[in-house]
Interface confidence: low
């Protein structure tokens, strides 16, 4: 792969071993403006696999608020507006990075943590298991 | 709100103002094990709004690899396996936190960044605009 030379203006790092502690500027550079998923789109209501959004709050985590999607139905909404159980509503999940305060309650010391969140739901054809 | 007392074992922080720099341990605590979205489920193929997953790589970002979903079709797959133009495949997007090397190429100095990623696709009823 390509080796990019280290910037001479980098801060010093005392510990070069893993696990390593790094400096992180919490002044977020935000490429987007909308943080409330309900305002960003109404897909959660218009989808054939609609979902509700639940607020998950944890003061020991950064960001402290995460929105979790929960599918409304086991099946999917058909053209008549009824639930079709030949299809399944399933959550689309994604692993995201969060910062966990460590030691607990510390304002300036964190550990990276990966968590799995449900972002929305999609309608899938079920896997039918045939018994021999 | 509840005020949680500061842990006396916290590292010292010189700058209490925002933007503030914090210490982050990069030894990730992972509550999940599967990081390849294609292995985690086959929803992207079984969905009525199927999508392809594209690998987005950036060595100046942590994590350096992010998977982006792109909807395969304008419409959704109907019961016949054909594309139904009365419905629309749309991407479900989520804001996630990543670490951006700052200054560039520094191994131990980062800035938090919010980016918008498409996680998967869902099938929605289109908004029909009626002309008066």
């Amino acid at each position: 792969g390509i080796t990019i030379p280290r910037n001479p203006g980098c801060p010093n790092s005392e510990d070069k071993n893993f696990p390593r502690t790094v400096m992180v500027n919490l002044n977020i550079h935000n490429r987007n403006t909308n943080t409330n998923p309900k305002r960003s789109s109404d897909y959660y209501n218009r989808s054939t696999s609609p979902w509700n959004l639940h607020r998950n709050e944890d003061p020991e985590r950064y960001p402290s608020v995460i929105w979790e999607a929960k599918c409304r139905h086991l099946g999917c909404i058909n053209a008549d507006g009824n639930v079709d159980y030949h299809m399944n509503s399933v959550p689309i999940q994604q692993e995201i990075l969060v910062l966990r305060r460590e030691p607990p309650h510390c304002p300036n010391s964190f550990r990276l943590e990966k968590i799995l969140v449900s972002v929305g739901c999609t309608c899938v054809t079920p896997i039918v298991h045939h018994v021999a | 709100g509840i005020t949680i007392p500061r842990n006396p074992g916290c590292p010292n922080s010189e700058d209490k103002n925002f933007p503030r720099t914090v210490m982050v341990n990069l030894n990730i605590h992972n509550r999940n094990t599967n990081t390849n979205p294609k292995r985690s489920s086959d929803y992207y193929n079984r969905s009525t709004s199927p999508w392809n997953l594209h690998r987005n790589e950036d060595p100046e970002r942590y994590p350096s690899v992010i998977w982006e979903a792109k909807c395969r079709h304008l419409g959704c797959i109907n019961a016949d396996g054909n594309v139904d133009y009365h419905m629309n495949s749309v991407p479900i997007q989520q804001e996630i936190l990543v670490l951006r090397r700052e200054p560039p190429h520094c191994p131990n100095s980062f800035r938090l960044e919010k980016i918008l990623v498409s996680v998967g696709c869902t099938c929605v009823t289109p908004i029909v605009h009626h002309v008066a």
Epitope: - | L74, G75, N78, D80, N82, D84, P126
Partner: antibody, heavy 118, light 110 residues
């Protein structure tokens, strides 16, 4: 080899009607969505309409909605475009295309000319 | 509805490289695939790039496509230009409710 052959074009007066056909061969016709795309003389391409493989779902550009009807006969491997209330601005070469919207195949016919003039 | 804007014309000499841009007026270009079509005079369009950067079989590797999310634009690059590349080139994309073509770019190989 995929082949698409349009027919039915010609000269028609404003307010008149015309029916275009597209005979398809070289692929399983019923498995593919089909589209009509037009090109006015000396102008660019404009998407007109599309239909799902089964024929159950249709989709139209705003400029033709309510005037044009897309349909297909899978037993005859033929795509149709019924054009009513024709206007001078509908004058164009009309192309039939397979699976155009996603561009994975993007096969096009050679086109048929429709002229709306008094 | 959104628009796709292309330069009206570009020209370059044989053997050189030319790039044609396609800018989306609203909505993220990155969310939906971009296609590129070549149309020679008197002929029907043929697809040269689909899904942003994929080449159909039979299209030379001199043709390549790319996306720049920061400028909300797509590009078609043709390297080692040949006289037979002289044609009109159209970009195409879509949104949840419409399919749109760019206005086309006339490529002249000098």
């Amino acid at each position: 080899e995929v082949q698409l052959l349009e027919s039915g074009g010609g000269l028609v007066q404003p307010g008149g009607s015309l029916r275009l056909s597209c005979a398809a061969s070289g692929f399983t016709f019923s498995s593919y969505a089909m589209s009509w795309v037009r090109q006015a003389p000396g102008k660019g391409l404009e998407w007109v309409s599309a239909i799902s493989g089964s024929g159950g779902s249709t989709y139209y550009a705003d400029s033709v909605k309510g005037r044009f009807t897309i349909s297909r006969d899978n037993s005859k491997n033929t795509l149709y475009l019924q054009m009513n209330s024709l206007r001078a601005e509908d004058t164009a070469v009309y192309y039939c295309a397979r699976d155009l919207i996603w561009g994975v195949a993007g096969s096009w016919g050679q086109g048929t000319m429709v002229t709306v003039s008094s | 509805n959104f628009m796709l804007t292309q330069p009206h014309s570009v020209s370059e000499s044989p053997g050189k490289t030319v790039t044609i841009s396609c800018t989306r007026s609203s909505g993220s270009l990155a969310n939906y695939y971009v296609q590129w079509y070549q149309q020679r005079p008197g002929s029907a369009p043929t697809i040269v790039i689909f899904a942003n950067n994929q080449r159909p079989s039979g299209v030379p590797d001199r043709f390549s496509g790319s996306i720049d999310s920061s400028s909300n634009s797509a590009s078609l690059t043709i390297s080692r230009l040949k006289t037979e590349d002289e044609a009109d080139y159209y970009c195409q994309s879509y949104s949840p409710t419409s399919v749109v073509f760019g206005g086309g770019t006339k490529l002249t190989v000098l």
